[in-house]
Each structure stands twice: as structure tokens, then as C-alpha cells.
């Protein structure tokens, strides 16, 4: 690093609000797509390269050239599996997080033309190749169709779709944001032959209503009616069917089979909530209760003879948590072995931390094959001989994520592939593996600058650099920039992590104002390895503001006892966390606690309020940007996971004495800007309306802004950069700062 | 090798009570779900309630809800079937049985106890 | 509910002969449809799961078929002692509904 420890003498710029806002210093991907066991597509300058994994060569898959006359603005592509097709993607139309509507054309790449027959129809939904060969399965106006041949007329497979009411081959709004987090509710058997799919029926599922005001000659705002169930509200019901695609006739209407949920789960209000093929003709489903403490996955096989698929309660696999809700979000998903008769599963162990457990189909115990006072993150390949895993084993540090790779004839042979590769730069690993798991891709996004690099696993040797953002370290080398601390403190005999951006030439004799950036939702984590370049980079450089984070009760990937801990009870322990972090960070010395603040965004703008509004005396000031203020006005699927239904026999009284609302009092002693756009489905605006008229109606005064047209993200280019310059004055405000 | 037997049953007056039981043998009533079916004189199957004692959750027909608990007891591996303000038309040979699939048929029956309401 | 209709409700038919049950239901079955056979003074018996999966044991004389609403029970040559009472059964939706049985006799 150049310049100085003194401050006055290091004459380099800082990290500037700008930088931040039109992305001055930018971190470099490298965003590769596996094709086969060896090979993956790169885009450089727009050329889609192909490269050999062992050898490092490439060639051209796809000049730039090729769709010059497209007359399209081509959005994605996504080329088939046997390298005869590419879809191309445009006329994208974002919908909600995950959803989206397109144009599809289809390229052959053998005649190298546009297919002009029997094309996919404008406004689909949802497109996908099946994973050997060249079919293709899209939804649109809610049905399903399926593409033998891409120049051939579609099957119709369902045709029960409607807007709003019956979704075939996609999920609704609470499917889509907390179930799946994605819009494709199909599933194609490994080898193509079968396509499963989920309905959803909204029929009963009350609308959420809000004003969309558009253009501004729009003399009448648009109403938009979104079919949301809210906590206790009646929910969506699925249904799960599969379809033979070769069978498929142009004379008969295609025949699905359903497959129906558990008993257990017919009793009562339930979710699908995975779906994983073991074998050509076995699928695994998993059905969640709605009180999401009890989880049933059913392993079922076609039957040739009828055409139908057998699901036995002799291969039913029970998850249960007595302590809270199953999985971190949902449970787990499973990797079937190649003869789909076992299983590797994440699963909470006795101790209540995640870990991989072996499963045989007949047999309803399972082996635990990795241990320890840790969690594994994730399950990234299974080959015949190994299991590799990500997770925060190494240094006994939750933040951190390496990649291990697990003997599957010895447990005990383990060993971390990533953990001494460069251990000061990287400590923070995801991965990306070829089709068969001999190459592999690790993608290191902190402490230092993210570094791309390519491996084998035959030997586990790095292969190349693919990206080492040189370039960008060279520029940073001018720029004052913080540095980051993780580290951990101790309450009631229990390490609870927490990071620090500090300013540059960060003196511990000195007083900084701190600003606590809070999310706090169960299972998140928030003190980690990552490297960023954020809104609080440029707080830290330009401003000297400390910005820390802190993982308190109910944060995850340290165990069940800290997640869990806020089981029936949000906006308890998290939020009582956060204030004891902050008195915590005062008594370091170097924080000035007549400037301290916090900030957060959905859940963290929910604790942000519930910190403000606790009146205990920490704070000076905060944001809040689009919270949570009642969790009756939340959606079902994530609100009654954590807390129950809201009825009297329930936990309706926790429902009623953890809003935002309530606390509108307290208030009085704290500056607070509430910010929320009018168009977010996800956190109504109704929910920053109610505290609003809460303040309104005690006499608090506080600041508000509101971002019309703006949904949950507040992402658009010109309301990003307003929402971080108004809160950059309001910090700064706050902290009497220039 | 798998058996289910009832035993509980018996004579008893209109307004009385009576508990049935299902000892569970060759499987574990804890990975599976126990129904009580019943079959009143000459008469088809009726479906009476269900149970899930791994999950402890249960189902019962509307004619016998707020009458009938259906329990479990894992240790002994034994479902019950309390049976509270019975009536004359609650009068039938009661089965245990186990789920087979997913689909709902049951392929491991009782030998099924008879209970007769009558004053 | 679903309600399960059995027709005939009893029918007279000689050893060898081919017979038929037929299952209707109030609205489309989700999951399928058991079939169960069932001798005085004894418990049921699986036949048939899930519409048409013969369930072991069981002689491949029987079969089940159907979809939607309509199902059948088919004994291709009937032996002696197949005459009994035969039962249809829907779990795929709840609660559980049964047909009110068929009784095969002899002729």
C-alpha cells in the first residue's frame, strides 16, 4: 500500500461517494458456463469463446458478428446441450426478484440461421433445454409447452393456466421469492425423457393491491393486484405432476400423471418445497408442513406397466425440528448416488449444527460423515469416489468458506482444497464444477481483491489464473481505502462475530462515529471474509465513519442454538443484540458514543426501527428502508416459519407486541428517516405507511422519503443514487460532519 | 415379520367410553402412520382417524371429531383409539391398519376388535 | 369429501369368468385409487395401489386401471376364491373415502 501511516501526509483520494454511485473502481468476474466435463463458454468483448479446461486453449463458439442483423438487443443465451442450438433471449420484462417475461429465437448452429418456423411465442415465461439433447420446455400465459424438434410445432401439455389464478411450470409471488427462489417450476428428468412440474392454484390467495403511477401523463394510476397471502392468510395449494415427452402425439392431448403429497401433508396446509431427480424414472419430492417444523420427502419410482409413479412409505424420510423450523431456509436439497438407491443431505445434527448426513432409501436412519462445532454450507459435487463440500470449518471462523473434498470409502479422509491456496488473500470460496466434477472453478471474494482460478480434480492442481483484478489493485493502490476487521465478542459464553470497516490510518486512540449496518433475519450473516466495494467503503474512506456489522442471536452457520434462538419471538433477541453490540463497540475506545447510528434495508430496516423505537439511549439517529412494521403484513411462507400463525391459540400476542408500530413513542429521542418505494410487492408500502401514521399520531418528527414507482430494490439508476446521496446527508447530518 | 392386533373392545351403553388399542410389530409406528377404519354390521369401511406419532400430528372423520383421540405411544409401539359419548351408529368391528404409499392404501390390517353400543 | 361409488354393488359370476368393477368418484382423484378384497369375518386385503400397481403377493390375474373420475378393478379369469367383497378407496385427497363395496358371488 503507498502513502503513509499519517493521514495529513497520505495525499491520495478517498473513496468517494461517486466511486461508489457510477462504479468507478470495478471488480472483474470471470463468469464461465461448463459445456461438458472439459470445456466452458467464456464472453470476451462479445465473443462467446470456447476453452479447453485442461489445456487453457480456446477458439471462437460464437463471433459477435453473428447477430449483427438480429435487429434485437439479445439480453441472455443459453445454448443446448448438444451444442446443435442457442436460444437467445430479448424483450426481457422484469417482473419480481426471480420472474421475468422475453422473446426467444432460436439459432442452429449446424446451418448456421435463425429458425423462422414455429417459434417460441412473445411474452413467455419461462424456457428451458432439457439437459441431454435438444428439447425444449416454456411456459407460456401460465401452460406448459414442450418442443421436440425447435423447428417443429409445440405439445401443449396443460392447459388449465390462468393470470393470477392457475400457474403451470411457474411459481407465484410467495413460491417464487420464499420457497423456490425461482420463477421455473419444472423439473426435466436427467435424461429428458420425463417432465415434472408444479400447479399453483391462487384461487383463494387474497390480492395485495398497490398504485402504479407510471408515465407522467397517466392521468388514472394503474392498480397492481398481486395474489400475496400474508401470515395467517389462506395460501396457495400445489399439485405435481409428470409427463412422458416421448409419448407425446399431436392427436391425443398429452396425459400427466400426478404424484400427490404425503398424508401427512393432504391434512393440513402444506408446501412442495424441493423436487430432485436420483434416477431417470425415481424423484425425490419434499413436502413441508405450514408450521415448518415437519418435513416429509417421498422417493418415488415409475411403474412401466401403468405409466405411473409409486411413492412407498417405506421411503419416506422424516425431517423434524423440535427447536425451531426445518432447514436453514427450507430443507435441504439431496444428492443422489448414480444408482439413486442413497443420498448425502444437510441436516442438523444432535448438536443442532448442519451437517451431511448419508441416507439409504429403505432405510430411515442416516450417517453423519462430517461433525464438529462448524456447519456445512453446501453440498457442491458427489462423484463415485468423493463428496466436496463448502464449509466455515476452517479457523473455526463462521465468516469464512472453504471447499473440502470428503473420501466416500473412508470419512475420515478429508481435506481442504482451498484452505492454504492463498490464505490471506482468500478466504471466502465458491465453486463451480464441470459436468463431472474434473474440473473445477474457485471463485475467492475476500479479504483480498476476488481471484478467479482453474483446477483439476485428478491431482486438485490449479491449472491457470482466469482473474486476479491486477488491474484494479494497481488503481486501488491510489485510493485511500479502509481496512477490515472480524473478529468476535463474548456474551453469556458465547462468541458472537462482528466486522468493522475502519477509516484509513485507522487510530485506536481516536473517536470515530460508528454506524451499525444491521440485517439481523434468521439464518444471515453479516460478519464475513467478502471483499466490497459498497456504500460503506466510501463512509469509511471519504467520511472516517466506522461501519460495522454484528451477528447476533439468530444469525446462521454457527448452529441451531444461536439460530434458533428467536424461534417465535422476531424482533426480540436480534434486535436486543444489535443495542448490546453497539454498547459493546463503545467500550473499545475508539468510538465515539454520542455519534453512533444504524442503517438497514427490509428485515434490517425492521430492526433498525425496533433499535430506535427500544429507547435505549445508544442511537442517535437511523435509517430505515422498506421495513418490516407488523409481521401480519408479511408473507406467510418466511413470517410463519419463525413465528407460528397469528391466532390466539397460536402466537398471535408475539404478533401484536413486535411492531414497529408500538414503540412509535420512543422515537422522540432518536432522528429517523424511513424510506420506502410505493411499488415494492415484496415489503408492502403499507408497512412504512403504518409507522408513518404511528409517528404522525404521537408527534414524533422525522424525515421520510418515498420512491415512486420503486419496488423492493430501489434499484433503478437514478433512484439508487438518490436513496445513498439522501442517506450520505443524513449520516453525515447526524454526525455533524461537513 | 409385520402385525398389527386391536384389542379394547366390547359392550358398552350409549354416552359411555371405551379405548382401543393397536400393538405394532416388525416396523416402528414412529417411521409410518396408523388409521383406524371401521365397519359397522354388514356395512362398507369407513375411515375413523389417523395418526403420525413421529410428528404427533393426527386426523380424525367429521362423525367422530371432538368424541374420538387417536394417540400414540412409541415406547410400546401401541396407537389408541379413545372413544368418548359413543352412540348406538359408532357400533362396528374397528381395524388398525399402516400406510403402504403415498397414495393412501393400507397394506397391513388388524384382525379388527368389535365394539357394540347398546343399552 | 370425495364419494366413491361402486357399481354393481354385488354381481353373479362363474369360475373363469372376466370380471369388472367399476369406481366412480365425486370429482378427480388426486392421487389413485386402492383396491382392496375383503372375506366375512376378515380383515381387507391389498390388491391394488395407486390405480393399477399390483401389490405383492397378490396374483397377476388382478389389475387396476383409470384415471380422472373412472376406475376399475378387472379379475381376468376368476378362481374360487376370489368371491368376496371388493372395496375402492381414495387417499389422495382427505380425508380418505371408500366405495360402499361390490359383492361377487357365485352364479
Known amino acids: 500500500n503507498k502513502g503513509t501511516d499519517d493521514a495529513t501526509a497520505d495525499s491520495r483520494k478517498t473513496y468517494t461517494l461517486t466511486d461508489y454511485l457510477k462504479n468507478t473502481y470495478r471488480l472483474k468476474l470471470y463468469s464461465l458456463r461448463w459445456i461438458s466435463d472439459h470445456e466452458y463458454l467464456y464472453k470476451q468483448e462479445n465473443n462467446i469463446l470456447v476453452f479447453n479446461a485442461e489445456y487453457g486453449n480456446s477458439s471462437v463458439f460464437l463471433e459477435n458478428s453473428t447477430f449483427d442483423e438480429f435487429g434485437h438487443s439479445i439480453n441472455d443465451y443459453s445454448i443446448s446441450p448438444d451444442g446443435q442450438f442457442i436460444l437467445l433471449e430479448y424483450n426481457y420484462v422484469k417482473q419480481w426478484r426471480h420472474s421475468y417475461t422475453a422473446s426467444y429465437d432460436i439459432y442452429d448452429l449446424n446451418k448456421r440461421q435463425l429458425i423462422t418456423e414455429e417459434r417460441i411465442p412473445n411474452n413467455t415465461q419461462w424456457v428451458t433445454w432439457s439437459p441431454v439433447g435438444h428439447k425444449l420446455a416454456y411456459v407460456w400465459n401460465n401452460d406448459i409447452y414442450v418442443k421436440i424438434e425447435p423447428n417443429l410445432p409445440s405439445y401443449r401439455i396443460t392447459w388449465t393456466g390462468k393470470e393470477d389464478i392457475i400457474y403451470n411450470g411457474i411459481t407465484d409471488w410467495v413460491y417464487e421469492e420464499e420457497v423456490f427462489s425461482a420463477y421455473s417450476a419444472l423439473w426435466w428428468s436427467p435424461n429428458g425423457t420425463f417432465l415434472a412440474y408444479a400447479q399453483f392454484n391462487d384461487t383463494e390467495v387474497p390480492l395485495i393491491e398497490y398504485s402504479f403511477y407510471s408515465d407522467e401523463s397517466l392521468q388514472y394510476p394503474k392498480t397492481v393486484r398481486v395474489p400475496y397471502p400474508k401470515a395467517g392468510a389462506v395460501n396457495p395449494t400445489v399439485k405435481f405432476f409428470v409427463v412422458n415427452t416421448d409419448s407425446l402425439s399431436s392427436v391425443t392431448n398429452a396425459t400427466s400423471i400426478q404424484i400427490t403429497a404425503p398424508a401427512s401433508m393432504l391434512i393440513g396446509d402444506h408446501y412442495l418445497c424441493d423436487v430432485t431427480w436420483a434416477t431417470q424414472e425415481r424423484i425425490s419430492l419434499q413436502w413441508l408442513r405450514r408450521i415448518q417444523n415437519y418435513s416429509v420427502m417421498d422417493i418415488c419410482d415409475y411403474d412401466e406397466s401403468s405409466g405411473r409413479w409409486n411413492c412407498l412409505v417405506a421411503r419416506q424420510h422424516i425431517e423434524m425440528s423440535t427447536t425451531g423450523w426445518v432447514g436453514r431456509f427450507r430443507p435441504s436439497e439431496p444428492h443422489f448416488t448414480l444408482d439413486g438407491n442413497s443420498f448425502y443431505k444437510i441436516i442438523s445434527n444432535e448438536e443442532g449444527y448442519r451437517h451431511i448426513c448419508y441416507f439409504q432409501i429403505d432405510k430411515k436412519d442416516c450417517t453423519f460423515i462430517t461433525k464438529g462445532t462448524w456447519e456445512v454450507i453446501g453440498i457442491e459435487a458427489l462423484t463415485s469416489d468423493y463428496l466436496y463440500y463448502i464449509s466455515n470449518e476452517y479457523k473455526g471462523m463462521p465468516g469464512g468458506r472453504n471447499l473440502y473434498k470428503i473420501q466416500l470409502s473412508d470419512y475420515t479422509k478429508v481435506t481442504c482444497l482451498s484452505c492454504e491456496l492463498n490464505p490471506e488473500r482468500c478466504q471466502y470460496y465458491s465453486v463451480s464444477f464441470s459436468k463431472e466434477a474434473k474440473y473445477y472453478q474457485l471463485r475467492c471474494s475476500g479479504p483480498g481483491l476476488p481471484l478467479y482460478t482453474l483446477h483439476s480434480s485428478v491431482n486438485d492442481k490449479g491449472l491457470r489464473v482466469l482473474e486476479d483484478n491486477s488491474a484494479l489493485d494497481k488503481m486501488l493502490q491510489n485510493v485511500q481505502m479502509p481496512s477490515k476487521k472480524l473478529d468476535f465478542i463474548i456474551l453469556n459464553e458465547t462468541k458472537f462475530w462482528y466486522q468493522m470497516i475502519l477509516p484509513p490510518h485507522f487510530d485506536k486512540s481516536k473517536k470515530y462515529p460508528l454506524l451499525l449496518d444491521v440485517y439481523a433475519g434468521p439464518c444471515s450473516q453479516k460478519a464475513d471474509t467478502v471483499f466490497r466495494l459498497n456504500w460503506a467503503t466510501y463512509l469509511a474512506s471519504t467520511e472516517n465513519i466506522i461501519v460495522a456489522s454484528f451477528d447476533g442471536r439468530g444469525s446462521g452457520y454457527q448452529g441451531d442454538k444461536i439460530m434458533h434462538a428467536i424461534n417465535r419471538r422476531l424482533g426480540t433477541f436480534e434486535v436486543e443484540d444489535q443495542i448490546e453490540a453497539a454498547r459493546q463497540f463503545s467500550k473499545m475506545g475508539f468510538v465515539d458514543n454520542k455519534r453512533i447510528a444504524i442503517w438497514g434495508w427490509s428485515y434490517g430496516g425492521y430492526v433498525t426501527s425496533m433499535v430506535l423505537g427500544s429507547g435505549s439511549g445508544v442511537f442517535k439517529c437511523g435509517i430505515a428502508v422498506a421495513p418490516v412494521s407488523r409481521w401480519e403484513y408479511y408473507d406467510s411462507v418466511y413470517t410463519e416459519r419463525y413465528m407460528g400463525l397469528p391466532t390466539p391459540e397460536d402466537n398471535l400476542d408475539h404478533y401484536r407486541n413486535s411492531t414497529v408500530m408500538s414503540r412509535a413513542e420512543n422515537f422522540k429521542q432518536v432522528e429517523y428517516l424511513l424510506i420506502h418505494g410505493t411499488a415494492d410487492d415484496n415489503v408492502h408500502f403499507q408497512q412504512s405507511a403504518q409507522i408513518s401514521k404511528a409517528l404522525v399520531d404521537v408527534g414524533v418528527d422525522f424525515q421520510a422519503m418515498w420512491y415512486t414507482d420503486e419496488d423492493h430494490g430501489i434499484a433503478s439508476s437514478t433512484a439508487h443514487q438518490h436513496i445513498y446521496t439522501h442517506m450520505s446527508h443524513f449520516i453525515k447530518q447526524c454526525f455533524s460532519l461537513p | 415379520e409385520v402385525q398389527l392386533v386391536e384389542s379394547g373392545g366390547g359392550l358398552v351403553q350409549p354416552g359411555g367410553s371405551l379405548r382401543l388399542s393397536c400393538a405394532a410389530s416388525g416396523f416402528a409406528i414412529n417411521n409410518y402412520s396408523i388409521h383406524w377404519v371401521r365397519q359397522a354390521p354388514g356395512k362398507g369401511l369407513e375411515w375413523v382417524a389417523s395418526?403420525?406419532?413421529?410428528?404427533?400430528?393426527?386426523s380424525y372423520a367429521d362423525s367422530v371429531k371432538g368424541r374420538f383421540t387417536i394417540s400414540a405411544d412409541t415406547s410400546k409401539n401401541t396407537a389408541y383409539l379413545q372413544m368418548n359419548s359413543l352412540r348406538a351408529e359408532d357400533t362396528a368391528v374397528y381395524y388398525c391398519a399402516r400406510f403402504f404409499s403415498s397414495y393412501g392404501d393400507m397394506d397391513y390390517w388388524g384382525q379388527g376388535t368389535l365394539v357394540t353400543v347398546s343399552s | 369429501d370425495i364419494q366413491m361409488t361402486q357399481s354393481p354393488s354385488s354381481l353373479s359370476a362363474s369360475v373363469g369368468d372376466r370380471v369388472t368393477i367399476t369406481c366412480r368418484a365425486s370429482q378427480d382423484v388426486s392421487g389413485g385409487v386402492a383396491w382392496y378384497q375383503q372375506k366375512p369375518g376378515k380383515a381387507p386385503k391389498l390388491l391394488i395401489y395407486g390405480t393399477s400397481g399390483l401389490y405383492s403377493g397378490v396374483p397377476s390375474r388382478f389389475s387396476g386401471s383409470g384415471s380422472g373420475t373412472d376406475f376399475t378393478l378387472t379379475i381376468s379369469s376368476l378362481q374360487p376364491e376370489d368371491f368376496a367383497t371388493y372395496y375402492c378407496q381414495q387417499g389422495g385427497d382427505w380425508p380418505i373415502t371408500f366405495g360402499q363395496g361390490t359383492k361377487v358371488e357365485i352364479k
Open positions: 395418526i403420525w406419532p413421529y410428528g404427533g400430528f393426527t
